[in-house]
Interface confidence: medium
């Protein structure tokens, strides 16, 4: 066996093993997505997290899983069976993914102000329509998750929620905010979480009531809700995690470039496709 053949064999099995790993990873991601779609309650108790935006994540996970499995399958079979058409398709898919990521990176860096404003507009709409539309639960769950994780409330200020007539206390009642705004570590008083399910949500029955984000909490004392708006919270989070984010993006990009290089190298150095196919007759 020549050095070139052993090199090609090494690349072939390297591509196969790594893509097999990504195929398994993709199928796991897909299974998680399907699990959430079918049975949210058991997933929440398994994960043990409050305010998880399940509706969005179930679809994101399922689609990402299928996509990862698809690409990995092309790489696996293409490398193992030494099929140029599959390796070419694998290279093409990775190139498309890489190009999309580069485009997104450029857009994010050049259109930052517009993106920030678009995000603010989406958040404003979510806040204004909170709890009124059963179709909007995905956006509400996502925003609740952001508030809960970043320990913030509203966009600019927690008072952003007071603008929503539906959440405003009537008469002398306290103002209300979603429970994801609550700083649970600031109080030991369990009764402080005066949960008020909106009348609109009661129409949705058990599903709505089991959803954390459907819970509206009274604000008996300012100290019990996060004082910072999420615009500042997001900026802080991005600032603190910038190196990690850039690192992950670079890592993923380099991994894609590596696989692209290996697949095209393997593809170009294979014998003619017909000779290969003849071998498996």
């Amino acid at each position: 066996m020549s050095a070139q053949e052993s090199c090609l064999s090494l690349i072939k099995y390297f591509l196969f093993v790594f893509n097999l790993f990504f195929f398994v990873l993709g199928s796991l991601i897909f299974c998680f997505g399907i699990w959430i779609l079918i049975d949210k309650t058991s997933f929440v108790s398994f994960v043990g997290l409050a305010f998880v935006p399940l509706q969005i994540w179930s679809k994101v996970l399922a689609i990402s899983g299928i996509f990862t499995m698809g690409i990995a399958l092309l790489g696996c079979v293409g490398a193992l069976k030494e099929l140029r058409c599959l390796l070419g398709l694998y290279f093409g898919m990775l190139l498309l993914l890489f190009a999309t990521q580069i485009t997104l990176g450029i857009l994010i860096s050049t259109q930052r102000a517009q993106l920030e404003r678009s995000l603010r507009d989406v958040v404003e709409k979510t806040i204004q329509k909170y709890g009124t539309n059963p179709e909007e639960t995905a956006a509400e769950e996502s925003w609740d998750y952001v508030q809960f994780q970043l320990r913030c409330c509203g966009w600019h200020y927690p008072q952003d929620w007071f603008q929503v007539l539906i959440l405003r206390g009537n008469g002398s009642e306290a103002h209300r905010v979603p429970c994801s705004c609550y700083n649970l570590s600031a109080t030991n008083d369990s009764t402080i979480l005066d949960k008020v399910i909106l009348p609109q949500l009661s129409r949705l029955g058990h599903l709505a009531r089991s959803r954390h984000s459907a819970d509206i909490c009274a604000v008996p004392a300012e100290s019990h809700i996060y004082r910072e708006g999420c615009a500042q919270g997001l900026q802080k989070w991005l600032h603190n995690n910038l190196i990690s984010i850039v690192g992950i993006c670079l890592g993923v990009g380099l991994l894609e470039l590596g696989f692209m290089t290996l697949s095209i190298f393997l593809c170009r150095n294979l014998d003619h496709v017909y000779n290969r196919l003849a071998r498996y007759r």
Partner: antibody
Framework: QIQLVQSGAEVVKPGASVKVSCKAS????????MYWVKQAPGQRLEWMGY????????TYNQKFKGRATITRDTSASTAYIELSSLRSEDTAVYYC????????????WGQGTLVTVSS | DIQMTQSPSSLSASVGDRVTITCKAS??????VDWYQQKPGKAPKLLIN???TRHTGVPSRFSGSGSGTDYTLTISSMQPEDFATYYC?????????FGQGTKLEIK
Amino acid sequence: QIQLVQSGAEVVKPGASVKVSCKASGYSFTDYNMYWVKQAPGQRLEWMGYIDPYNGDTTYNQKFKGRATITRDTSASTAYIELSSLRSEDTAVYYCARSPYGHYAMDYWGQGTLVTVSS
Amino acid sequence: DIQMTQSPSSLSASVGDRVTITCKASQDVSTAVDWYQQKPGKAPKLLINWASTRHTGVPSRFSGSGSGTDYTLTISSMQPEDFATYYCRQHYSTPFTFGQGTKLEIK
């Protein structure tokens, strides 16, 4: 830190125009509306209008519509109010103030610009 | 337009006194009320928004309350730096309107 710095005092003749500027720093200029408020000597504060610096949308108090024009220059993070056909009753201190939304409190204010209309 | 009527127009108080300023709207403004403090020759400063929420950095002696048409600003214990003019404002509907102000003077 967040600052709104207004242009200096102006003395103008009746019938003339004046443009007052308000330079913002320490925050994202396009993310907050800019209000303009008038305070005539010994009088209560009066809301004149506001601009959304992101898209230039303006909302005016009908009382000032036509004689007050609010604009902005996003590259300079500056908001402006131009007052035309000035009369003696326009003599006042004009304040700019930022607000997260239209229907919201004004959390930071400029130092004010005194406009004196005198012949 | 919604009228905001403040009372009293002026008030004399001593350091340590509890002071209450009221503001009455000509129609229900659904807690969309702010309170501002203004010292001579200075710009107004936000104290309370949404009727009862203290703005960042405002001392706890300042508190706001109210609903519907009646709103109150309370200073639990007057300090020398609190002598100023106080304005209420509604931002429920345009044109946003201010009260005529309450001048707090040293007794």
